[in-house]
Interface confidence: low
């Protein structure tokens, strides 16, 4: 079954390297590397590094799946994050004494800043840092729907953990929906799973930056660790380019 | 960008056809087509056709995803089904007056008949036929865990429907677990999603063959339509062959 | 996407999914598969004409990457992307069997 | 699976994932990507030696299908199976950007 054809490994590697050069530029829709003339000296800003690291960590936690890739997904996605509205905001007032849930509100205008048009959004994740916990709990995520109603989004079984861990929920559809509506405050509810006959419906999970137990909301000292939306979107200028060439092959 | 190489389409098709000949035989681990000497005359038995149809319908409802295929998944899987224990069985007695749930019990020995060894099971689906309904409801599936406790498995938002429709839940892990335990009766609970502050926790969904409303359990006339487990497993003789060659490349 | 919707309705010369129906009796001379009588297997065919070279005018070929070499392979190849399984019914002795064969139907192709 | 675990620790001649680290500065002459400095791109290489022919002794080659031509292609090809994305940081003018590039890292290969 041998092919009796010797392979020039170095040539293959060189071809692959050159192909990658084109691949990266094409994914960014750049005809040539960007000019570095205006790049400020010194290290990268801390916020940028944090964003890069959380994107990298997300990749490491994902399974490597060869999903069929729609044309728009070939191109690079800009990654931004939108922090939850500050816990001191009055909007949290009426949620304080609810033991089965914690609430996270977001300002849609901040989201629109990062993603101006709904179709540009390719993925939105709600990221929460869960503090260490010795109990197992089944939790659910809801989306604020109308004045006093909530729409179920998903659930998770949280096992005990010795260290803080990041939880991630895919909320792409929800965020796209928000972008299609007017500006305002929108939110999520993170709840204990309440079964039909269960008595203890208390949420035993603590989330960094929002758990009511933490006096003075120390979590906000580490602003990076309070709940946020991680957004992946096609930049507007790249999308316009993509749209104009969509029907060519 | 043309390759300037004419392609003999007929040759390619012939090669593909021959490759498929080998592919099908290899997936069934057959060195040659099976003898047809003992095949009974007449059409296929109705139960076999029903099983074939429900497998085919499942395929049509799935998205075509190129999942990375573990070696064992390359080979063909035999499809069988195990019906729920008859509704007249005394085991259902204590579940009669519960309005938030319906219950389905299965005999593990029936499952073991179809899948003698736990590792042979590649997929198990719980199939329920939901009757037409004008209401939307969020439902949950639980597995019987110990005497009086239930383990959450998954949920579904059921929208109104004019026609009966089949619901399918992946219960591979649960059935594998049952196969690892001794024989006996095991079961599932299909419940309304009870939210922490909800008052109406009644299950409004009717399932063919088990909904308590249906007097005299007319659903069992169409035995095919009562809840069942659809099992996909590697036949024992094929698995032994596979095991012996696993570490060769 | 280079799927049946696009490829079957166009005369695409490059990588695309091509129609192929397999009739078990006619094409393979088999009578032992009782259901189905045949199936749309399809196949992938066509060049992935990506120009690579250090002195290539990038602006000209960058737009071709997405279709012709999205994976930046050293020598891209037209291969199946989305596949579907095929259930069959056949007899072993007197016993009818329903079996599912994975990845039998090609629904779309890609340059990889 | 023809993944990094198997391929990097064996001397497999047939289709397998091969190691390749790209250093943006050294290999591509680029200083504009600030993070990461490089990445393990890897690539797929090796024959998919499937014998097809009407008069082939099936019993001999059937066992080879699983590895060498699981998709029953007319001319199987060694291509990426599992891929991973790569996040990068670069500047546009004075503004730092974090972007994610899909399907950049080859984790496993297959004959397709």
């Amino acid at each position: 079954l041998s092919t009796c054809k010797t392979i020039d490994m170095e040539l293959v590697k060189r071809k692959r390297i050159e192909a990658i050069r084109g691949q990266i530029l094409s994914k960014l829709r750049l005809a040539s590397p960007p000019s570095q003339g205006e790049v400020p000296p010194g290290p990268l800003p801390e916020a940028v590094l944090a964003l890069y690291n959380s994107t990298r960590d997300r990749v490491a936690g994902e399974s490597a799946d060869p999903e069929p890739e729609p044309e728009a997904d070939y191109y690079a996605k800009e990654v931004t994050r939108v922090l939850m509205v500050d816990r001191n905001n009055a909007i949290y007032e009426k949620t304080k004494d609810i033991s089965h849930s914690i609430y996270m509100f977001f300002n849609t205008s901040d989201i629109r800043e990062a993603v101006p048009e709904p179709p540009l959004l390719s993925r939105a994740e709600l990221r929460l840092q869960r503090l260490k916990s010795s109990v197992e709990q089944h939790v659910e995520l809801y989306q604020k729907y109308s004045n006093n109603s909530w729409r179920y989004l998903g659930n998770r079984l949280l096992t005990p953990t010795d260290t803080p861990e990041w939880l991630s929920f895919d909320v792409t559809g929800v965020v796209r929906q928000w972008l299609n509506q007017g500006d305002g405050i929108q939110g999520f509810r993170f709840s204990a799973h309440c079964s039909c006959d269960s008595k203890d419906n208390k949420l035993h999970v603590e989330i960094n930056g929002i758990s009511p137990k933490r006096r003075g909301d120390l979590g906000t000292i580490h602003d990076m660790n309070r709940p946020f939306l991680l957004l992946m979107a096609t930049p507007l200028e790249r999308a316009q380019h993509l749209h104009s060439s969509r029907h060519r092959r | 960008l043309s390759t300037c190489k004419t392609i003999d389409m007929e040759l390619v098709k012939r090669k593909r056809i021959e490759a498929i000949r080998g592919q099908i035989l290899s997936k069934l681990r057959l060195a040659s087509p099976p003898s047809q000497g003992e095949v009974p005359p007449g059409p296929l038995p109705e139960a076999v056709l029903a099983l074939y149809n429900s497998t085919r319908d499942r395929v049509a409802g799935e998205s075509a995803d190129p999942e990375p295929e573990p070696e064992a998944d390359y080979y063909a899987k035999e499809v069988t089904r195990v019906l729920m224990v008859d509704r007249n069985n005394a085991i259902y007695e204590k579940t009669k007056d519960i309005s938030h749930s319906i219950y389905m019990f299965f005999n593990t020995s029936d499952i073991r008949e179809a899948v003698p060894e736990p590792p042979l099971l590649s997929r198990a689906e719980l199939r329920l036929q939901r009757l037409k309904s004008s209401v939307e409801q969020h439902v949950e599936l639980y597995q019987k865990y110990s005497n009086n406790s239930w383990r959450y498995l998954g949920n579904r938002l059921l929208t109104p429907t004019d026609t009966p429709e089949w619901l399918s839940f992946d219960v591979t892990g649960v059935v594998r677990q049952w196969l690892n335990q001794g024989d006996g009766i095991q079961g599932f609970r299909f419940s309304a999603h009870c939210s922490c502050d909800s008052k109406d926790n009644k299950l409004h969904v009717e399932i063919n063959g088990i909904s308590p409303k249906r007097r005299g359990d007319l659903g069992t006339i169409h035995d095919m339509n009562r809840p069942f487990l659809l099992l996909m497993a590697t036949p024992l003789e094929r698995a032994q062959h596979l095991h012996s060659s696993r570490h060769r490349r | 996407a280079l799927d049946t919707n696009y490829c079957f309705s166009s005369t695409e010369k490059n990588c695309c999914v091509r129609q192929l129906y397999i009739d078990f009796r006619k094409d393979l001379g088999w009578k032992w598969i009782h259901e189905p009588k045949g199936y749309h297997a399809n196949f992938c065919l066509g060049p992935c004409p990506y120009i690579w070279s250090l002195d290539t005018q990038y602006s000209k070929v960058l737009a071709l990457y997405n279709q012709h070499n999205p994976g930046a392979s050293a020598s891209p190849c037209c291969v199946p992307q989305a596949l579907e399984p095929l259930p069959i019914v056949y007899y072993v002795g007197r016993k009818p069997k329903v079996e599912q064969l994975s990845n039998m139907i090609v629904r779309s192709c890609k340059c990889s | 699976a023809l993944d990094t675990n198997y391929c990097f620790s064996s001397t497999e001649k047939n289709c397998c994932v091969r190691q390749l680290y790209i250093d943006f500065r050294k290999d591509l002459g680029w200083k504009w990507i600030h993070e990461p400095k490089g990445y393990h791109a890897n690539f797929c290489l090796g024959p998919c030696p499937y014998i097809w022919s009407l008069d082939t002794q099936y019993s001999k080659v059937l066992a080879l299908y699983n590895q060498h031509n699981p998709g029953a292609s007319a001319s199987p090809c060694c291509v990426p199976q599992a891929l991973e994305p790569l996040p990068i940081v670069y500047y546009v003018g004075r503004k730092p950007k974090v972007e994610q590039l899909s399907n950049m890292i080859v984790r496993s290969c297959k004959c397709s």
Epitope: D86, N89, A90, I91, F105, S109, E113, G182, I185 | - | - | -
Partner: antibody, heavy 120, light 112 residues
């Protein structure tokens, strides 16, 4: 020190146009949403329009929608309000104001105002 | 009519405590949106006093405090001084209006 300085006001006839500018300094202009607020003689404050930090989202009060256009040039740290089809009820002092935090609609810095008079 | 209702005028003597109220609805104050208080001294631009219902802006004396309950917001000035004579406006985002932001009609505070 944060500073906002409006200019471009004046006397204009009904149906006429004016373009107001607001020069910003002392803060990273491109990080904040900014607003125009007006005050008719002897009356209270009335919100006119808002533009987001990157200039992507723009919002207008019903009274000016379709006639006024707000824009910004982050390179020049300048905010603009193009006013067309002016009416006598648009007579007011026009203030530009910056958000305390991005898109919070809380104005922690205001300009001194520029007078717009619409009269024949 | 303003969506946020304030008394048009109030008065108090030096050293006294006065409370200015602002009544809204569930689409503004009661909806939990940022509520602010502004002071406008005669002939000058408005100045932010209180943000997010109860937080003093920098440089604002602690004689000024804000609170909120349901659809009602209050600004309290303790130890009233002559320089506190001014117009006071509440302002809040309103989700029910296409206008987006609303101010109260203003309260003219006179120090006797």
């Amino acid at each position: 020190e944060v500073q906002l300085v409006e200019s471009g006001g004046g006397l204009v006839q009904p149906g006429g146009s004016l373009r107001l500018s607001c020069a910003a300094s002392g803060f990273t202009f491109s990080n904040y949403g900014v607003h125009w607020v007006r005050q008719a003689p002897g009356k209270g404050l009335e919100w006119v329009s808002h533009i987001s930090a990157a200039g992507i989202s723009r919002y207008y009060a019903d009274a000016v929608k379709g006639r006024f256009t707000m824009s910004r040039d982050n390179g020049k740290n300048t905010l603009y309000l193009q006013m067309n089809g002016l009416k006598s009820e648009d007579t007011a002092v026009y203030y530009c104001a910056k958000d305390r935090i991005r898109s919070s609609y809380e104005y922690d810095s205001w300009g001194q105002g520029t007078q717009v008079t619409v009269s024949s | 009519l303003p969506v946020l209702t304030q008394l048009s005028s109030m008065s108090g003597s030096p050293g006294q405590t006065v409370t200015i109220t602002c009544t809204g609805s569930s689409s503004n104050i009661g909806g939990g949106y940022y509520l602010s208080w502004y002071q406008q001294l005669p002939g000058t631009a408005p100045k932010l006093l209180i943000y997010n219902a109860n937080n003093r802006a920098s440089g604002v004396p602690n004689r000024f405090s804000g609170s909120k309950s349901g659809n009602l917001a209050s600004l309290t000035i303790t130890g009233l001084q002559a320089e506190d004579e001014a117009d006071y406006y509440c302002g809040c985002y309103d989700s029910s209006l296409s206008t987006g932001y609303v101010f109260g009609g203003g309260t003219k505070l006179t120090v006797l």
